[in-house]
């Protein structure tokens, strides 16, 4: 039994199977990429501000630390892939979508053509896809996390798409629109079956999903409120209506975290009541996007997690299953699930 020899090299749990040993972790710990070492996962607030991306530990009350990234000019939307320890961001000056490790190393552009104002972006951590909204081209697009196999998903009847949120377990994408009739919309993650959820709303920003309680949260830039609804846009609740200028928003555990452009701050409150407010950080410049980097924000299962759903290029989650997709101008062969060039 290899586990008998120095615990199989595992820091905590060692599982012996007929083919190999496998390390595991007790509940609450995480396995590092070496597949042997368990660590206590740390939760970070990560946010974009001008030419920098910053992080703040939520557990050790560390001060605001700029991630040492090169080549950032005007960072806008932000997301992460916890399994690869990557952060992704859009830059409206460079007109690119980039990624790097959380320590700032290995910066690379994953999308660098055909972008105008990419102000919304979300990582599909199950299908390993990147979704983004462009208020200039009026499109929502998808590609693999490395930028390959890019496809336009939604382009009809879009009016300034802004903030994106994904629920890959259920197969839905949510977004906000800031056009003449602002609204919150839901579709399948393949871009089909678009449906307006909320139309009596101002410019909704930083749409956020509470996966545990199945609630949507957003800031309304026209009313300066933080609101919440169920996943169908119903059961709307005002979480806060006395804030000067809330902008960015994220949720983690029992709390929501938001940025305020008048107070130049990041604050926290109970996610259901908006009470017990705490100042997390003050004296901040205009924060464009904010999120919590933690594995609990990227949990769950779907078809695309196993062998890319047998798809040759894109595996796009839909309710109850998935659909294979191809890069623009490529054609899907339904039987082989591969894509043919034009």
């Amino acid at each position: 039994n290899p586990c008998a020899d120095r615990n199989g090299g595992c820091s905590h749990l060692c599982f012996f199977t007929p083919h190999a040993t496998r390390c595991g972790c007790p509940i609450g710990l995480e396995l590092l990429s070496d597949m042997k070492t368990c660590i206590v996962p740390e939760a970070f607030l990560v946010f974009t501000s001008r030419a920098a991306i910053h992080r703040i530990s939520l557990e050790t009350n560390n001060n605001d630390v700029a991630i040492p990234l090169t080549g950032v000019k005007e960072a806008s939307a932000l997301d992460f892939d916890v399994s690869n320890n990557h952060i992704y961001w859009t830059d409206v000056s460079l007109k690119t979508i980039s990624r790097a490790f959380m320590n700032g190393s290995s910066v690379e552009h994953v999308v660098e053509f055909g972008l105008d104002y990419p102000e919304g972006m979300a990582v599909d951590w199950m299908g390993k896809n990147l979704y983004w909204a462009d208020t200039g081209t009026n499109r929502i697009e998808v590609a693999r996390l490395d930028g390959q196999f890019r496809q336009v998903l939604v382009w009809r009847d879009l009016d300034n798409p802004r903030s994106l949120a994904l629920d890959p377990t259920k197969g839905y994408i949510y977004w906000t629109e800031w056009g003449g009739k602002p609204r919150i919309v839901r579709a399948f993650m393949d871009g089909t079956n678009c449906m307006t959820l909320v139309d009596k709303v101002g410019r909704a920003n930083d749409l956020t999903i509470d996966y545990a309680d199945q609630r949507l949260y957003w800031t309304d830039l026209d009313t300066n409120m933080i609101e919440s609804s169920n996943m169908l846009g119903q059961e709307r609740v005002v979480i806060a209506d006395d804030l000067p200028h809330p902008f960015g928003l994220t949720q983690y555990s029992d709390y929501i975290y938001w940025t305020d452009w008048n107070l130049h701050s990041i604050e926290r409150a109970d996610k259901t009541s908006g009470r017990n407010r705490t100042l997390i950080q003050g004296h901040l410049d205009f924060v464009m996007d904010i999120l919590v980097f933690h594995s609990s924000r990227q949990d769950g299962l779907n078809d695309c997690m196993h062998n890319n759903g047998q798809c040759g290029q894109l595996c796009l989650a839909i309710p109850g299953g998935h659909r294979c997709g191809c890069a623009s101008h490529y054609t899907l062969d339904p039987s082989s699930r591969n894509c043919s060039p034009p």
Epitope: E74, Y117, T135
Partner: nanobody, 126 residues
């Protein structure tokens, strides 16, 4: 506090060009995004163009895209609006404005600007 003074307006024939300038006083000019708005008689003030704090991103109204170009020189505390292929419907008072929001499509909205100039009149007529 930022003070803004526009110049360069005047009478021009259709198809002609003008270059508007906006000089800003104050040491914090480079931390502000700058925008141009216009107001024709009897109409609402409307967005024309904006440029981010660094000059890295620019934003235009559909009606002027391809004809107008916004730029800035942070060393001179000045923002410019180069207007080509002018049309009679471009006739308006043009206002320069400063926004503390550094960049993004929010710069298209006038209520996101804190400081305004007095305006300069542009008349396009034959």
């Amino acid at each position: 506090e930022v003070q803004l003074v526009e110049s360069g307006g005047g009478l021009v024939q259709p198809g002609g060009s003008l270059r508007l300038s906006c000089a800003a006083s104050g040491r914090t000019f480079s931390s502000y995004a700058m925008g141009w708005f216009r107001q024709a008689p009897g109409k609402e003030r409307e967005f024309v163009a904006a440029i981010s704090w660094s000059g890295g991103s620019t934003y235009y109204a559909d009606s002027v895209k391809g004809r107008f170009t916004i730029s800035r020189d942070n060393s001179k505390n000045t923002v410019y609006l180069q207007m080509n292929s002018l049309r009679p419907e471009d006739t308006a008072v043009y206002y320069c404005a400063a926004s503390p929001i550094p960049y993004g499509s929010l710069l298209r909205r006038r209520n996101n600007y804190d400081y305004w100039g007095q305006g300069t009149l542009v008349t396009v007529s034959s």
